[in-house]
Each structure stands twice: as structure tokens, then as C-alpha cells.
């Protein structure tokens, strides 16, 4: 299962950690996709490492763990974020986070 804070807030110009926690006794995580609405933010793959989409590469840092640190937040970053955990043999698990960026 995926466990996450469903709603988080942060100040404009600040940073925030987007984190989904996957727990399973048997399944192994093979890939994690992070999206902002429908736009790819980053991918982690056991076989490839981290890839951060070019448009976010100056503001998104992988980690901690399989999460993301989103820096230099703007009001436009307010919205839904989705993590998708690809696991073997467990299948695919999804989590949702709503980020509210507040004026500083």
C-alpha cells in the first residue's frame, strides 16, 4: 500500500518534500514515477537511476529516499502531484498529494 500526506502546504520561494511511502512484505520497487498533474516530474528506476524532466531540473532534487525535494516554489506549483510505484511482483500502486503554495 501507499501511505502519504494527502495535503501539504509550503511558502512561495521555499521548498517542500514530496514523499510517498510504499510498504510490502513481498514486493520490490522497480520504478517510481512522479507527475505534476499529467506532466512528468521525475522517474526513478532501479536499472537506470534518477531522471528529472528538463523543465524541472533546476528546482527538483531526488530524495530523500524515493521522494522529491521541490525548491524555489511558485504559486503556479499549487496542484495535484502523483506518485506511481511499480513493484514486482505486486503490481502498480498510486498515491496523490495536494500541494498548496502560500504567499510569503
Amino acid at each position: 500500500t501507499i501511505d502519504t500526506k494527502r495535503n501539504i502546504s509550503a511558502e512561495e520561494g521555499g521548498s517542500v518534500i514530496l514523499q510517498c511511502h510504499f510498504s510490502s512484505d513481498t514486493a520490490e520497487v522497480t520504478q517510481v514515477d512522479w507527475k505534476q498533474q499529467d506532466q512528468l516530474l521525475a522517474i526513478y528506476s532501479v536499472d537506470l537511476g534518477w531522471h528529472v524532466a528538463s523543465v524541472f531540473s533546476d528546482r527538483v532534487v531526488p530524495g530523500p529516499s524515493l521522494g522529491l525535494t521541490f525548491q524555489s516554489l511558485t504559486m503556479n506549483d499549487t496542484g495535484e502531484y502523483f506518485c506511481t510505484y511499480h513493484t514486482y511482483p505486486g503490481g502498480i500502486y498510486k498515491g496523490r498529494i495536494f500541494l498548496k503554495v502560500q504567499e510569503s
Epitope: 536499472d47 537506470l48 531522471h51 528529472v52 531526488p62
Partner: antibody, heavy 119, light 107 residues
Framework: EVQLVESGGGVVQPGRSLRLSCAAS????????MHWVRQAPGKGLEWVAV????????LYADSVKGRFTISRDNSKNTLYLQMNSLRAEDTALYYC????????????WGQGTMVTVSS | DIQLTQSPSSVSASVGDRVTITCRAS??????LAWYQQKPGKAPKLLIY???SLQSGVPSRFSGSGSGTDFTLTISSLQPEDFATYYC?????????FGGGTKVEIK
């Protein structure tokens, strides 16, 4: 024997297209991520692109993004690189390569196929 | 993208010498570093992955160490067949990137 054999290289004018192929044998091709890496004459190695085992995802170096397309046909054990809008700086020896699972390192390479972009 | 800086760019050595090549990453990459050997007209050959794991079939005179940003490839006793160019490669981030290469030449 695990083997990768590239083909399709040649001399092409700037702005034109070329499609490279990489025939795989000796391993379960459809279970592996596959990569293209290139090497300009007398220069170092540059990673170009990767494709997921089932072809569901593809990622590219910024230098080729929007111009090159990696694809695969698992029924034919073949990897492809479609190269459009070629530039002089794309002149290189192009290798396909297979990784050691989970190691993020490339243990089997083809012999390479040379692409020369020149007017 | 992560930059990898190899040093030296070339080294002259004799058979039996101990040779050390370093690779420095522009940011931390944990232990996600591989080393390759390339001879003229040939494809690269994987020597080391995961910074220190010896690839199957590679002689034990090759060893790798390091983590974070600083890595080393050591050839404990150089053999005639070891004269070649050596590249490091990081795989913490895509795009994977390679160092500029170190040419090991005969003194």
C-alpha cells in the same frame, strides 16, 4: 554467445535521416533495457538513449531529443534508432549496448556502426 | 547533468607498474560508478560496476574504490594488454555520463 550487431550507418547530408538497427542474440532481449551510446571520432563516449524492456518508456540525451527516436521489436530481437534532422555534430560511431541488470553498467556492446553527416 | 572529471588524461607506465586513475563527479552519485577499458577500433569493455564490483572474467589486478564524488581505478601490476583508454561512467542520474578518458601508454 551473447551478441549485438549494429547496421544502417553511412554517409548522409545534414538535415537528412537515417535508421540504425541492432540485432540481438544469445539472451532474452525482451527482458532488458537497451541503450544507444555514441563516440565521435577521436573523442569520448556519449550516452544517447534508452528504451524500457517493453518499449513503454524512452529517454534521450538533450543533444538528440526531438530528433532521434529509439524503438524496439521484441519479436525480432531488434533495437532501432531513427535519426532525423541530422547535424555534423552527430557524426560518430554508434553502439547499442545491454546492461547488467540492476548494476547500471553496460556489459555487452556491439561493434558499432559509423554515421557521417557531411555535405 | 553530472560532469565526470578524469585524471590524469594520459599516463605513461611500464609493465609491472601500479597505475591509479581518478574520477571526480560534480555531485554525489553514491556508488553508481562503472569503469570501462577501450582499445583502438574496439568497443568498450566493462571492468568495474557499483564502484568496486569486478565484472565477471576481468582479471583481479583491476580494482575500484570510492563513493560519493571521488572514485579510483587501480591496476596493481600493469600487463601488456592493459595499454588502452579507460573511462568512468556515472549512473545515479540519467543522462548517464562518461568521463573524458585516461589513456594508459607505454613508457
Amino acid at each position: 554467445e551473447v551478441q549485438l550487431v549494429e547496421s544502417g550507418g553511412g554517409v548522409v547530408q545534414p538535415g537528412r535521416s537515417l535508421r540504425l538497427s541492432c540485432a540481438a542474440s544469445g539472451f532474452t532481449f525482451g527482458s532488458y533495457y537497451m541503450h544507444w551510446v555514441r563516440q565521435a571520432p577521436g573523442k569520448g563516449l556519449e550516452w544517447v538513449a534508452v528504451i524500457w524492456p517493453d518499449g513503454s518508456n524512452k529517454l534521450y540525451a538533450d543533444s538528440v531529443k526531438g530528433r532521434f527516436t529509439i524503438s524496439r521489436d521484441n519479436s525480432k530481437n531488434t533495437l532501432y534508432l531513427q535519426m532525423n534532422s541530422l547535424r555534423a555534430e552527430d557524426t560518430a560511431l554508434y553502439y547499442c549496448a545491454k546492461p547488467v541488470p540492476k548494476s547500471r553498467a553496460l556489459d555487452v556492446w556491439g561493434q558499432g556502426t559509423m554515421v557521417t553527416v557531411s555535405s | 547533468d553530472i560532469q565526470l572529471t578524469q585524471s590524469p588524461s594520459s599516463v605513461s607506465a611500464s609493465v609491472g607498474d601500479r597505475v591509479t586513475i581518478t574520477c571526480r563527479a560534480s555531485q554525489g552519485i553514491s556508488s553508481w560508478l562503472a569503469w570501462y577499458q577501450q582499445k583502438p577500433g574496439k568497443a568498450p569493455k566493462l571492468l568495474i560496476y557499483g564502484a568496486s564490483s569486478l565484472q565477471s572474467g576481468v582479471p583481479s589486478r583491476f580494482s575500484g574504490s570510492g563513493s560519493g564524488t571521488d572514485f579510483t581505478l587501480t591496476i596493481s601490476s600493469l600487463q601488456p594488454e592493459d595499454f588502452a583508454t579507460y573511462y568512468c561512467q556515472q549512473a545515479f542520474y540519467l543522462p548517464w555520463t562518461f568521463g573524458g578518458g585516461t589513456k594508459v601508454e607505454i613508457k
